[in-house]
Amino acid sequence: IVLRPSRVHNSEENTMRALTLKDILNGTFSYKTFFPNWISGQEYLHQSADNNIVLYNIETGQSYTILSNRTMKSVNASNYGLSPDRQFVYLESDYSKLWRYSYTATYYIYDLSNGEFVRGNELPRPIQYLCWSPVGSKLAYVYQNNIYLKQRPGDPPFQITFNGRENKIFNGIPDWVYEEEMLATKYALWWSPNGKFLAYAEFNDTDIPVIAYSYYGDEQYPRTINIPYPKAGAKNPVVRIFIIDTTYPAYVGPQEVPVPAMIASSDYYFSWLTWVTDERVCLQWLKRVQNVSVLSICDFREDWQTWDCPKTQEHIEESRTGWAGGFFVSTPVFSYDAISYYKIFSDKDGYKHIHYIKDTVENAIQITSGKWEAINIFRVTQDSLFYSSNEFEEYPGRRNIYRISIGSYPPSKKCVTCHLRKERCQYYTASFSDYAKYYALVCYGPGIPISTLHDGRTDQEIKILEENKELENALKNIQLPKEEIKKLEVDEITLWYKMILPPQFDRSKKYPLLIQVYGGPCSQSVRSVFAVNWISYLASKEGMVIALVDGRGTAFQGDKLLYAVYRKLGVYEVEDQITAVRKFIEMGFIDEKRIAIWGWSYGGYVSSLALASGTGLFKCGIAVAPVSSWEYYASVYTERFMGLPTKDDNLEHYKNSTVMARAEYFRNVDYLLIHGTADDNVHFQNSAQIAKALVNAQVDFQAMWYSDQNHGLSGLSTNHLYTHMTHFLKQCFSLSD
């Protein structure tokens, strides 16, 4: 299936050029998306090209600037947030990145009624997190690991927590492992729907072992970065959830929400919090052995001023074939009765589908079904449920948006996006206004991305929000590679792959092959999305064929494929890449002597193991920031898939699945090992141990480190990295510079 239109007129060929590495590094062909910042059923805010904050009313068609670029510039604001009562805007500046989601910033409050910044009782700096209440203009913020509340922006703050301590106690913000592996947010506090209550998590990291690494900087002595980071089997953070009444917070104080008894009996995690009403909250908990999850619905008892979580409102989700959920345990979407909810979990056939839970999970009503998966529930209204799935035409790497009418019986299903721009758009996400009155569709490809606005009742397209015209024009004289998404059937396993082919691809010729792999549990690489990136350049300019393969352990194709890797990471993911390579060779256009593999993070682990598989298939390969032993990686992630590194659990496979154990097998391949020294996620330790094992085995290899760079290798390091990898591959494939 050719997803990119091929050129028709040969006369065009002369004026067209291949992609260059510079194009990629400069982001010349990057695209834009448009996500409305919804503030009501029919209004949204958007930051214009000249940095004004503009309010759009869909129904009147009017728009006006609520905050000028002059005001933004006066405090060097890079972000903003309008209070729900529309009286104030917070302006965010001095952004300073911490980990994947977290950052600190300076905040200024601007009063829209008088056009002045709020003076007196200004916010401290830097703030770790700040947000408005959902109604009115109360502010909650986290400063130095403690939570503060302002009843009004000009008021003095009320301190809610007092025990916050750097690297020890975190209130309202997650510690490293919860941020990266559980919540995937920079915050751990949640307002109730009308702002009456504020729930927050407290993470106690006192007993967690600390990872320490040098940050070289510019000083005479490097400084040491210390992060409480639980590796597999280590002591974990202790989490507690509290709720405080924000009307009179100084009276009762924070009230702890009880943990379900079956969860509290051993090590556990808190996984998410969902407010249902102002006086009903839903908490999700997970055993440390992550195959049992409990959803607990708690009610406020006015007379006791406590939160009551009756056993009758505990819903257990258990997996017998793997871990609970997909990457994370799914979160519930409550219906209007404030007790029943919709949730995605595995059906009896092992496919993730939407279920409706009214009383017990056992009595759940299955809403979607089939040999495909429901991926996200966007919105539930009185009469409709909007969700995304990969059902359409049986392509797991697509995403379409569906509407199920839940107001009528039997419920009817309609694909909202399947036939809108069928060739251009096969991978969508959506953003809904209040009550789903309107929604934006963001199409990511396979054609050039486009964002559109739609009527929530009729699904009619109202207008194009962003169509990337400039990008379209810029690409007109570029020889883009061709892309195809197909599948291989091998031993009852379906291996979907994406192949990126040189523009003048000729099946009768032989091409060098580069496998790009990630392969982590519940990931998906073969997606129908648009991208002009490094591998596009390698195909366009350097004439390589690039392939991405989704093997066992990957997502959205059922539990059989997903949970195949349970407790044995590093086996089937590698086998399936090798199997695919053999099949590609059989296709006849791959030069068997010029096959390489590369990957980053989990992909670096898989590429390393593939290179050390002893198959003789790969001439060379690259591992960027690889995991080398699961004992070195974070507890929450690792144990989800591998269990514990103890004798009576899974220590044996922890030991067997290291890259170091296969050091001897690197002798006959060219290996490039790359890592940032300040990687907070996959620690440099991983590559240091690979290097040590290779040296001890007297195996030659190439390596590059990036001083003071984290897992993302950003900034100038990115340019250096891709230039370096390009040289390595061209040398490996005997391509002239």
Partner: antibody, heavy 116, light 108 residues
């Protein structure tokens, strides 16, 4: 009806110790943060300490390290263990329902006199 | 810590008269965290007003509170014989919670 009844006050020498108790009834004791407030002739009303239903404690700087607040939810009782007592700790000690404000119910108070 | 200064120290009035008691904070206090108490000799303090202006349960409507920022007022619209007592303002906006030194309302 909410009732708070303090006991344990008395005369003690400087450097000595005393343990105050407050028996609570008429409300779900375990749910509420409770405080000790004192009234001394020289200082007026002064907040001393608080303890949440779950046992988290808070102290005024003037008593930190010397006084320990605790509670027994099964007995509906609040305690204040006072060590290294000083003359300036002389006051009527009230137990009150509430964290920082408001204190909506107060006991009758118990007198602590620190004198040699 | 926040210092609360009450004025006047003593207020001499007759029953039926209006009493206006002032409480000034050394720094801004959010009205949500300002309370007033009444104390009679030999008795425990009694909560009158919380949140600067909300009457506690069972408090007659002749008692009212107002103010914001650093200036707060307790007003007793018509003094009754049982209203003669010491009145304290209190803030809980910042730890430690602090009380004013009190205003004594006495019979003239």
């Amino acid at each position: 009806e909410v009732q708070l009844l303090e006991s344990g006050g008395g005369l003690v020498q400087p450097g000595g110790s005393l343990r105050l108790s407050c028996a609570a009834s008429g409300f779900t004791f375990s749910s509420y943060t409770m405080s000790w407030v004192r009234r001394s002739p020289g200082k007026g009303l002064e907040w001393v300490s608080a303890i949440s239903g779950g046992g988290r404690t808070y102290y005024a700087d003037s008593v930190k390290g010397r006084f320990t607040i605790s509670r027994d939810n099964s007995k509906n009782t609040l305690y204040l263990q006072m060590n290294s007592l000083r003359a300036e700790d002389t006051a009527v000690y009230y137990c009150a329902k509430g964290w920082f404000t408001p204190f909506d119910y107060w006991g009758q108070g118990t007198l602590v006199t620190v004198s040699s | 810590e926040i210092v609360l200064t009450q004025s006047p120290g003593t207020l001499s009035l007759s029953p039926g008269e209006r009493a206006t008691l002032s409480c000034r904070a050394s720094q801004s206090v959010s009205s949500s965290y300002l309370a007033w108490y009444q104390q009679k000799p030999g008795q425990a303090p009694r909560l009158l007003i919380y949140g600067a202006s909300s009457r506690a349960t069972g408090i007659p409507d002749r008692f009212s509170g107002s103010g914001s920022g650093t200036d707060f007022t307790l007003t007793i619209s018509r003094l009754e014989p049982e209203d003669f007592a010491v009145y304290y303002c209190q803030q809980g906006n910042q730890i430690p919670p602090t009380f004013g030194q009190g205003t004594k309302v006495e019979i003239k």
